[in-house]
Interface confidence: low
């Protein structure tokens, strides 16, 4: 629905009248930043504002998911005249301000990236005191986290009529291709569900009917690497055992 104007509008006349970008509200963020899981990434964000010299209190905020309403992952506040932005929130301690908000720079460093960090981030600055202005990037920066495959679950489950099936779930970005190998199988991509709804980096492959005892191996591969895990099926005494 339509966003209300309070806290959601920009000084458009400054945009039109002043040729210097330093004299209007604007925010510069790249469309996307890519980094590998486990590494660190820098989310650049710089801004301009219409106040010639603003030295009052300010707050720098980063939020994830959606602008204006998404959860905050980082927040810091700088007192009047201070160049130090005191961190008030850093989700899981992994977010750190690299830029200096007094120098119109809100760039953020994200440590120890995980695939769950793959989302859009929005920077915001709030001035307080003499002026009550705040501005947030509308489109944000997409953090694209890449990762070599990792098999997160492999299991053998009973099926109707005393049969067994095997499930293999792996994560990675790009989403990995899964293949099964095992007795009388060769290599099989049987019943791959890719990716699971709501779990964008997870891929599951099912072997619907295990016809022979022995070792079944699931291999996950993408452009960054490969991973494999095995389960063992023993049907004597009607039991099954799994080992990875």
């Amino acid at each position: 629905f339509v966003r209300t104007k309070i806290d959601t509008t920009e000084n458009l006349l400054n945009t039109e009248v002043h040729s210097s970008p330093a004299q209007r509200w604007s925010m510069q963020v790249p469309p996307e930043v890519s980094a590998e899981a486990g590494d660190a990434a820098v989310l650049p964000c710089t801004f301009t504002h219409p106040h010639r010299h603003y030295d009052g209190p300010l707050t720098a905020i980063w939020r994830a998911g959606e602008p204006y309403a998404g959860p905050q992952v980082f927040r810091c506040a700088a007192a009047r005249g201070s160049e130090l932005c005191q961190t008030a929130l850093s989700l899981h301690g992994r977010f750190r301000l690299l830029g200096n908000p007094r120098r119109n720079d809100l760039s953020l460093r994200v440590e120890r990236l995980a695939l769950a960090d793959d989302r859009r981030y929005f920077c915001r600055v709030e001035f307080a005191g003499d002026v009550h202005d705040r501005y947030e990037s509308r489109h944000g920066v997409r953090l694209h986290v890449t990762a070599a495959p990792r098999i997160v679950n492999i299991s053998v489950l009973p099926s109707p009529a005393h049969a067994f099936r095997a499930l293999c779930t792996a994560e990675g970005e790009p989403p990995p291709a899964l293949a099964w190998s095992g007795p009388a199988l060769g290599n099989s991509l049987a019943a791959v569900r890719s990716p699971r709804e709501g779990h964008g980096h997870l891929v599951t492959a099912e072997l619907p009917a295990l016809t022979h005892d022995g070792r079944y191996t699931c291999t996950a591969a993408n452009s960054l690497g490969r991973s494999e895990a095995s389960v063992y099926l023993f049907r004597f005494h009607g039991a099954s055992g799994a080992s990875t």
Partner: antibody, heavy 123, light 112 residues
Framework: EIQLQQSGAEVKKPGSSVKVSCKAS????????MHWVKQAPGQGLEWIGT????????AYNQKFKGKATLTADRSTSTAYMELSSLRSEDTAVYYC????????????????WGQGTLVTVSS | DIVMTQSPLSLPVTPGEPASISCRST???????????LYWYLQKPGQSPQLLIY???NLASGVPDRFSGSGSGTDFTLKISRVEAEDVGVYYC?????????FGGGTKVEIK
């Protein structure tokens, strides 16, 4: 240069409908909310409602619910207001007006206006 | 709905003299963020309205500095320090605090 170009004057019969257009240029259409304002002959200004061209979301003055329908075509950067079941009291000049916004409170109100469209309802 | 009331209805002015228009709202237009969401527009004869003042006291770009806005949460004033012939028209105040946005009834400024 930002401009809002409205469609020409219309003469309509009571009970009929009319669709007024407002073509925006000089800016990214989806970055502005479009508002519509009514001015009856010799009268003041009345806010009808607004549409967010990016999402199609609308907000109406209760008085104009069921009378005015706001739409927007992003492909042509044009906003529309359709007035239905026209009566003589709908005779007025209708303005579209907009201003840029993003997630900040540094607004300036309705800085840009169309030239107005006169809708005359007469049998 | 917030009701906006303007006075006077008509204001005859002498070029070079000051002029003042009042506007009152039935609810405070002061938001918790410190902004007062009151705006002034001028509609010259045969033209679309144009913005004069935004957020109670900020002069819109291109508007001569003889115009100024002031007020509190519910009582507002538009002042013209020295009226010029081109200032004739109908002046409207408007609240932009909440839907539906509402205008005052207008004040017609004309040269004596």
């Amino acid at each position: 240069e930002i401009q809002l170009q409205q469609s020409g004057a219309e003469v309509k019969k009571p009970g009929s409908s009319v669709k007024v257009s407002c073509k925006a240029s000089g800016y990214t259409f989806t970055d502005y909310d479009m508002h519509w304002v009514k001015q009856a002959p010799g009268q003041g200004l009345e806010w009808i409602g607004t549409i967010d061209p990016e999402t199609g979301g609308t907000a109406y003055n209760q008085k104009f619910k069921g009378k005015a329908t706001l739409t927007a075509d992003r492909s042509t950067s044009t906003a529309y207001m359709e007035l239905s079941s026209l009566r003589s009291e709908d005779t007025a000049v209708y303005y579209c007006t907009s201003f840029y916004y993003t997630y900040s409170n540094y607004d300036v109100g309705f800085a840009y206006w169309g030239q107005g469209t006169l809708v005359t309802v007469s049998s | 709905d917030i009701v906006m009331t303007q006075s006077p209805l008509s204001l005859p002015v002498t070029p070079g003299e000051p002029a003042s228009i009042s506007c009152r709202s039935t609810k405070s237009l002061l938001h918790s963020n410190g902004n007062t969401y009151l705006y002034w527009y001028l509609q010259k004869p045969g033209q679309s309205p144009q913005l004069l003042i935004y957020r109670m006291s900020n002069l819109a770009s291109g508007v001569p500095d003889r115009f100024s806005g002031s007020g509190s949460g519910t009582d507002f004033t538009l002042k013209i320090s020295r009226v010029e012939a081109e200032d004739v028209g109908v002046y409207y105040c408007m609240q932009h605090l909440e839907y539906p946005f509402t205008f005052g009834g207008g004040t017609k400024v004309e040269i004596k």
